[in-house]
């Protein structure tokens, strides 16, 4: 029959060539003469000319070594024709399969492969996987099943299997317990990867292990004791810088240390922050220190890290005693700030309160007082006794100098100490309110038409404060009610000025008395622009601008 | 009748180059491998050359390899020899054989003389 | 490279009578090996390709055959127009290799 079985052809023939593979055989050849061809990729398409077939004979030829890895199988079709060309048998399907041969090595992907595994773990665990082709073929045959294995592991220690590849997957783990960073941070295995499942070409990589830092070691005071001179009252001070070590990875939250202060602090003078760089613990004052009260301080520090321990290690502590220096300190006013209630407008000379200041030192120190700050100039302070007395009139409505009823003063007081500290103390006057001011009204310039005039209303105001402010009263003088009228409302804040007989067009002066609740009488002339003119008006029309 | 005649032989000088050329008839050329034997001239024959029906691909002995090149014409039926670098070992007579039922040297040629000397 | 060893080198023999040249392959080559007849005018022709399929328009008495390495022609009845040089070539291996040649002579 006109069917050629599949053909399995060898890669890498070693000829020689042209190499018969079979006979293409028409039985029509019988009856004719049957000429043989062939089409198809490796015949008379790319690649061409790999396979031919002799036309009166129908051999099939192989004229090249074929390569599996590069066309595992060709599909070319036979055709048979008579003397005259017409075709005598239907195309035929002729198959051939390139069979393997073993002659590729596998190939690792990378020629280094880089893992981790964190130091002390369990054997069983897995730290990472290489991987090898080869591009035999693995199915139908060993020549591409690759198995992996550990050829040589540096450094041996603490011996020399400490890893395992599992043959198949290529899966590097740990087999052998006693991993520390501290003592091996890294192993370098050199892996083989091996073609006939192991028993045929080996080719080699290296797999670097990088053994991770695991919180294995506790950071240790070195030294454990230490002395520090501190002054007094110094906040942010530097006491002590506690050194220690950690065998851990450097900058690493297992190295990195926190610092506690266990004992010796009831006061909560001290703190203690880490370096960021150096790992030391900076021992600081968060309060002032005070030698008179308690001139030294032990303190018990611990350390751990920023990280938790990954087994039960013991803490290492450091004793500090904190030596306080006795420095001069400066007088401290009692109160800082003295509030004192003093009627305004007294007389020179009156005293206005005494203020002074005591010396946390012990040994009894001479303290004198000064005014630092007295802006209106209108207080006196006696350098021995602290008495303050007035030395000008204190002005509650001296709107410059007085805030809110308030009179700040800056006082001074310096010890005889070497060399003298000074403490400042403030003084808050309270300004009590006299009866010094009468009510004035707002406008004091009015204009108004002489026909049908409008009502103008004029504001009281009183720089006193109440009970010497409203109610208010009104009266017109010096012939002025004859024209005018003048009522203050209801409310007793504003005054209403009335134009009550014709006056025509000029300017006059209106005398209007003012007095407050506790009597106090201010006279004041109000400027009235009478205009030619009906109902309201704000200047006179037509030419006339007064005078 | 398949025939096969070759030409181009000569006296040629070491170091020489010499062309040989083997017309074909009486069958389809383009569809058979062909090859070059030498015979010496203490009458051994050895394999020179041989080259795909298509042209595509060739082969050759170590003794000639990189000195000699097969090639074809299948449009004009004709094989060729081009020798270079010639030795006086390459003395000998050339015959051209076509491959038949996808065997070597079915058909011969009557061979051309080379010779190889100063 | 595979060697062909050819026996006898010479064979004197009458007309009439049986001959056998032998070739022996150094390695194994199959059935890939051809017997060729050289006249004294230089004619080359195939005799038997593949051991022992005879070429079309050779005599019957012309027969190939293997047993093991060793390779055989064998001319049943001598005639006149056998007398010449004859060579086996081997084709399972390369490079081809050609026998030394049996020179076959008129008693």
């Known amino acids: 029959d006109w069917v050629v079985a599949p053909i399995s052809v060898p890669e890498n023939g070693k000829g020689p060539f042209p190499q018969r593979l079979n006979q293409l055989k028409s039985n029509k050849d019988r009856d004719t003469k049957i000429f043989y061809s062939i089409t198809g990729p490796g015949a008379d398409s790319p690649p061409e000319g790999v396979f031919a077939v002799e036309k009166e004979t129908g051999w099939l030829l192989l004229n090249k070594p074929l390569d599996r890895e590069e066309i595992a199988k060709y599909e070319l079709y036979g055709h048979a024709v008579s003397e005259n060309g017409a075709s005598v048998e239907e195309p035929m399907n002729i198959s051939i399969i390139v069979t393997d041969q073993n002659d590729n090595k596998p190939k690792f992907t990378q020629d280094t492969f880089r893992g981790s595994v964190l130091e002390g773990v369990l054997p069983g665990t897995s730290v990472m996987q290489v991987t090898a082709t080869d591009e035999d073929d693995a199915i139908y045959t060993y020549n591409g099943v690759v198995a992996y294995s550990i050829h040589s592991q540096e450094p041996k220690d603490p011996h020399d299997l400490m890893f395992t590849i599992h043959r198949s997957t290529g899966t590097i783990s740990v087999i052998s317990s006693g991993l520390d960073r501290e003592k091996v941070p890294e192993y370098t295995l050199t892996i083989q990867a091996t073609d006939m499942d192991g028993d045929g070409s080996t080719t080699t990589a290296v797999a670097v292990v990088e053994i991770l830092d695991a919180n294995d070691n506790a950071p240790m005071f070195d030294p454990q004791k230490y002395e520090a001179h501190v002054p007094e009252n110094a906040v942010g001070h530097e006491v002590q810088r506690l050194t220690v070590t950690d065998l851990d990875a450097p900058n690493s939250p297992a190295w990195r240390a926190t610092y506690l202060i266990m004992g010796g602090d009831d006061g909560d003078h001290f703190t203690i922050t880490t370096h960021p760089e150096s790992n030391q613990g900076i021992l600081t004052t968060r309060k002032g220190l005070d030698f008179e009260a308690k001139n030294q301080h032990t303190l018990y520090v611990e350390v751990t890290n920023e990280a938790p321990f990954v087994l039960k290690l013991p803490t290492s502590t450091a004793t500090i005693v904190v030596h306080v220096e006795d420095v001069n300190e400066a007088p401290v006013f009692v109160p800082p700030s003295k509030v004192v209630e003093v009627q305004e407008g007294i007389p020179t000379g009156e005293p206005v309160c005494v203020y002074t200041a005591e010396d946390p030192d012990k040994e009894n120190q001479k303290i004198s007082y000064r005014i630092l700050r007295d802006p209106a100039g209108w207080l006196a302070m006696d350098p021995d006794s602290g008495q303050v007395t007035a030395v000008g009139t204190l002005d509650r409505e001296d709107e410059q100098f007085v805030r809110n009823n308030i009179y700040e003063v800056m006082v001074l007081a310096m010890d005889n100490g070497s060399p003298p500290t000074t403490g400042t103390g403030t003084l808050l006057l309270t300004l009590i309110d006299v009866n010094d001011h009468g009510p004035v009204p707002e406008p004091r310039q009015i204009t108004i038409c002489n026909q049908s005039p409008v009502r103008q209303v004029l504001n009281i105001t009183d720089k006193d404060l109440s009970p010497h402010t409203s109610p208010f009263q009104a009266q017109l003088t010096d012939d002025s009610d004859i024209y005018w009228t003048a009522e203050v409302n209801e409310e007793g804040d504003t005054v209403v000025l009335s134009l009550k007989k014709f006056l025509k067009q000029d300017t006059y002066d209106v005398h209007l008395s003012l007095s407050d609740h506790g009597n106090k009488e201010q006279l004041t002339v109000i400027r009235a622009t009478v205009c030619d003119c009906h109902g309201h008006v704000e200047t006179c029309p037509g030419p006339w601008k007064g005078g | 009748v398949q025939l096969v005649e070759e030409s181009g032989g000569d006296l040629v000088k070491p170091g020489g180059s010499l062309k040989l050329s083997c017309a074909a008839s009486g069958f389809t050329f383009s569809t058979y491998g062909m090859s070059w034997v030498r015979q010496t001239p203490d009458k051994r024959l050895e394999w020179v050359a041989t080259i795909s029906s298509g042209g595509h691909y060739s082969y050759y002995p170590d003794s000639v390899k990189g000195r000699f090149t097969i090639s074809r014409d299948n449009a004009k039926n004709t094989l060729y020899l081009q020798m270079s670098s010639l030795k006086s070992e390459d003395t000998a007579m050339y015959y051209c054989?076509?491959?038949?039922?996808?065997?070597?040297?079915?058909?011969w040629g009557q061979g051309t003389t080379v010779t190889v000397s100063s | 490279e595979l060697q062909m060893t050819q026996s006898p080198s010479s064979l004197s023999a009458s007309l009439g009578e049986r001959v056998s040249l032998t070739c022996r392959a150094s390695?194994?080559?199959?059935?890939?090996l051809n017997w060729l007849q050289q006249k004294p005018d230089g004619t080359i022709k195939r005799l038997i390709y593949?051991?022992?399929s005879l070429d079309s328009g050779v005599p019957k008495r012309f027969s190939g055959s293997r047993s093991g390495s060793d390779y055989s022609l064998t001319i049943s009845s001598l005639e006149s127009e056998d007398f010449g040089d004859y060579y086996c070539v081997q084709y399972g291996s390369s490079p081809l290799t050609f026998g030394a040649g049996t020179k076959l002579e008129i008693k």
């Open positions: 054989a076509s491959y038949y039922y996808g065997s070597p040297f079915a058909y």
């Open positions: 390695q194994d080559i199959g059935s890939s």
């Open positions: 593949d051991t022992s």
